[in-house]
């Protein structure tokens, strides 16, 4: 069994206000079984942005079909970006259980928001 890695290839992305931001995340193994969640910020104050198993998350869409069992791409697109969306976003794998437990995190992608072009 290959050890799971979570790859967030972009250290940072810059998006103009009003546009969509794509945050990339791929995993290298299907094990352990459990969902992927996206958060903005680290630690106890972090904010849930997307959860495979919950919803809806009106501004968030997945780039690929995350319900397919063999899917390893958990990239997301966030629409209508505002300055309040700035921060570091983490793609985190949870291990299935009662409750699910945090297993591993990507290194994070910083989202920087530029002023809307006039």
């Amino acid at each position: 069994e290959e050890e799971l890695q979570i790859i967030q290839p972009d250290k940072s992305v810059s998006v103009a206000a009003g546009e969509s931001a794509i945050l990339h995340c791929t995993i290298t193994s299907l094990f352990p079984v459990g969902p992927i969640q996206w958060f903005r910020g680290a630690g106890p104050a972090r904010v849930l942005i997307y959860n495979q198993r919950q919803g809806p998350f009106p501004r968030v869409t997945t780039v690929s079909e995350t319900t397919k069992r063999e899917n390893m791409d958990f990239s997301i697109s966030i629409s209508n970006i505002t300055p309040a969306d700035a921060g570091t976003y983490y793609c985190i794998k949870f291990r299935k259980g009662s409750p699910d437990t945090e297993f591993k995190s990507g290194a994070g992608t910083e989202l920087s928001v530029r002023a809307k072009p006039s």
């Epitope: 250290k11 570091t88 290194a107």
Partner: antibody, heavy 119, light 108 residues
């Protein structure tokens, strides 16, 4: 061989300005995010600022926000730090540091340049 | 902001002895942690990244371990050139990037 050479340090009075430079060689400068890290006398390391390879993304430590400006000239392979409204607590050795291509740790550092703010 | 606390502040050891340096994070940084060595008049040098991966050219007497909030840098047998100050740095919770306060390894 990667080389980072800082310059521009010196002695200034509180409230004055200084511009630091870091000349880079031995790698494709425009492809790497760059940082300034400082060390006050007898103290530990403190991250100051970072700039992405394109110059589009910039971050500052709260302690320097609004006073310091990081920039880069990729045609000259040079990183800059414009330091305004200097305070005594800005006295430190300022290091230029090259980031790893994947993560925000520093795989190469310069020798540093000393900035002294004193009346 | 993630605070890194290094211990001990100073380690007094003799050449040939084993050095164990600790770094504790105020919240989990997974394995996104680096170690640096600093000597007077020299540029800081990257030793370890991703908590346990040795940087290019670093001797194998240096090793890193840990994950989450507890990390260790071990120097298996101190050589004269290893007496220096060592810093940990986390690159998970950012900005800001944060460093520990340092551990000085001095000759006993």
């Amino acid at each position: 061989d990667v080389q980072l050479v800082e310059s521009g340090g010196g002695v200034v009075r509180p409230g004055e300005s200084l511009r630091l430079s870091c000349a880079a060689s031995g790698f494709t400068f425009s492809s790497y995010d760059m940082n300034w890290v400082r060390q006050a006398p007898g103290e530990g390391l403190e991250w100051v600022s970072l700039i992405s390879g394109s110059g589009e993304i910039i971050y500052y430590a709260d302690s320097v926000k609004g006073r310091f400006t990081i920039s880069r000239d990729n045609s000259k392979n040079t990183l800059y730090l414009q330091m305004n409204s200097l305070r005594a607590e800005d006295t430190a050795v300022y290091y230029c540091a090259k980031e790893n291509n994947r993560y925000r740790f520093f795989d190469y550092w310069g020798l540093g340049t000393l900035v002294t703010v004193s009346s | 902001e993630t605070v890194l606390t290094q211990s001990p502040g100073t380690l007094s050891l003799s050449p040939g002895e084993r050095a164990t340096l600790n770094c504790r994070a105020s919240q989990s940084v997974y394995t996104y942690l680096a170690w640096y060595q600093e000597k007077p008049g020299q540029a800081p040098r990257l030793l370890i990244y991703d908590a346990s991966s040795r940087a290019t050219g670093i001797p194998d007497r240096f090793s890193g371990s840990g994950s989450g909030t507890e990390f260790t840098l071990t120097i298996s047998s101190l050589e004269s050139e290893d007496f220096a100050v060592y810093y940990c740095q986390q690159y998970y919770d950012r900005p800001p990037l944060t460093f520990g306060g340092g551990t000085k390894v001095e000759i006993k």
